[in-house]
């Protein structure tokens, strides 16, 4: 449009004139008057501001606490937050990642169908016929029955999705 | 305080380009609109066009569509103003100017708070 | 192209002097008008802007009224520093036509 119909994309409008935004990782410090340009310091240490922005006060970049089974992921920088995500063995609760827990394990008839990571879960499946699981894992996927005839041997028992078959020798008293 | 610098003249054959630059500093480069004008010896003003630093996005005078290209570099805080296929014509002092806007009664009304010193291009055989 | 044509193009007079300069559009604006003054070898410099809102830091010799398609840009007093060409814009339609210029010159 033409004339402007608004202050232009990175201006806000204050006391009749549009100042320029401060940058990604600056915050204000005075707005622009009819004699001033619009004046921004960079955030410090431990502080961010990701937007173009006319705060005040830069954002503190997020704590991982250890306690809660967090580690850093990404270190923060005047322009961006922190990124958590958990400790080996554990994932985030939220997307936010304020909190972890401990990966579920599959139980026996269940194996893992997607291994956890730091922000998802475990993810486990029920074991089909002709596969098994008899532990309790955050690892291990369901396996195979033993094929009994390939090892010339014959089912003596049969697999459940918690055991696998029993094989033995072929019967060889014919009557 | 506000400053836009710009290179040096340039002295160039009819067909060939120039690029002019502009160097801002004293205030957030990417927060104004930047503006070309020329002024040819002894004449008037005449519009170009402009460029958004942010995002890059030119506008540019349908007198000038095809021939002159405006670009900026952010880390740098610069604007550049190209014009090709040079004429004989297009030999005058090209300036950059920063656009500011007030607002008053309901309307935005645009202006040139801030110019470059200009930069004389004479296009001669 | 809107085109604005400023009257006189050259205009003589002495310090003290009330000086005052039109700009006339050829449709109408609304109040979409800068005033600048150019001295040789430099670049404009925004005196006007919104057809009446004198720029910081310029003298309150200098005014602007007007509205639609007639404006006029007053020097109260003109002082040796005020002898310069002066050009209107109007930045209501692209391309934002100046006007031609107008040459304040001593008499």
């Known amino acids: 449009p033409e004339p402007p119909t608004a202050c232009r994309e990175k201006q806000y409008l204050i006391n009749s004139q549009c100042c320029s935004l401060c940058q990604p990782g600056q915050k204000l410090v005075s707005d622009c008057t009819e004699f001033t340009e619009t004046e921004c310091l960079p955030c410090g240490e431990s502080e961010f501001l990701d937007t173009w922005n006319r705060e005040t006060h830069c954002h503190q970049h997020k704590y991982c606490d250890p306690n809660l089974g967090l580690r850093v992921q990404q270190k923060g920088t005047s322009e961006t937050d922190t990124i958590c995500t958990c400790e080996e063995g554990w994932h985030c609760t939220s997307e936010a990642c304020e909190s972890c827990v401990l990966h579920r394990s599959c139980s026996p008839g269940f194996g893992v169908k997607q291994i956890a990571t730091g922000v998802s879960d475990t993810i486990c499946e029920p074991c089909p016929v002709g596969f098994f699981s008899n532990v309790s894992s955050a690892f291990e996927k369901c396996h195979p029955w033993t094929s009994c005839e390939t090892k010339d041997l014959v089912v003596q028992q049969a697999g459940t999705n918690k055991t696998d078959v029993v094989c033995g020798p072929q019967d060889r008293l014919r009557a | 305080q506000v400053q836009l610098v710009q290179s040096g003249a340039e002295v160039k054959k009819p067909g060939a380009s120039v690029k002019v630059s502009c160097k801002a500093s004293g205030y957030t480069f990417a927060g104004y609109y930047m503006y070309w004008v020329r002024q040819a010896p002894g004449q008037g003003l005449e519009w170009m066009g402009w460029i958004n630093p942010d995002s890059g996005a030119p506008t540019y005078a349908q007198k000038f569509q095809g021939r002159v290209t405006m670009t900026r570099d952010t880390s740098i805080s610069t604007a550049y103003m190209e014009l090709s296929r040079l004429r004989s014509d297009d030999t005058a002092v090209y300036y950059c100017?920063?656009?500011?806007?007030?607002?008053?009664?309901?309307?935005?009304?645009?202006?040139?708070?801030?110019w470059g010193q200009g930069t004389l291009v004479t296009v001669s055989s | 192209d809107i085109q604005l044509t400023q009257s006189p193009s050259f205009l003589s007079a002495s310090v003290g002097d009330r000086v005052t300069i039109t700009c006339r559009a050829s449709q109408g604006i609304s109040s979409y008008l800068a005033w600048y003054q150019q001295k040789p070898g430099k670049a404009p410099k925004l005196l006007i802007y919104?057809?009446?809102t004198l720029q910081s830091g310029v003298p309150s010799r200098f005014s602007g009224s007007g509205s639609g398609t007639e404006f006029t840009l007053t020097i109260s007093s003109l002082q040796p520093e005020d002898f310069a060409t002066y050009y209107c814009q109007q930045l209501a339609s692209y391309p934002w036509t100046f006007g031609q210029g107008t040459k304040v010159e001593i008499k």
């Open positions: 919104a057809a009446s």
């Open positions: 100017a920063r656009e500011k806007i007030y607002y008053g009664s309901g309307n935005y009304y645009p202006s040139f708070d801030y």
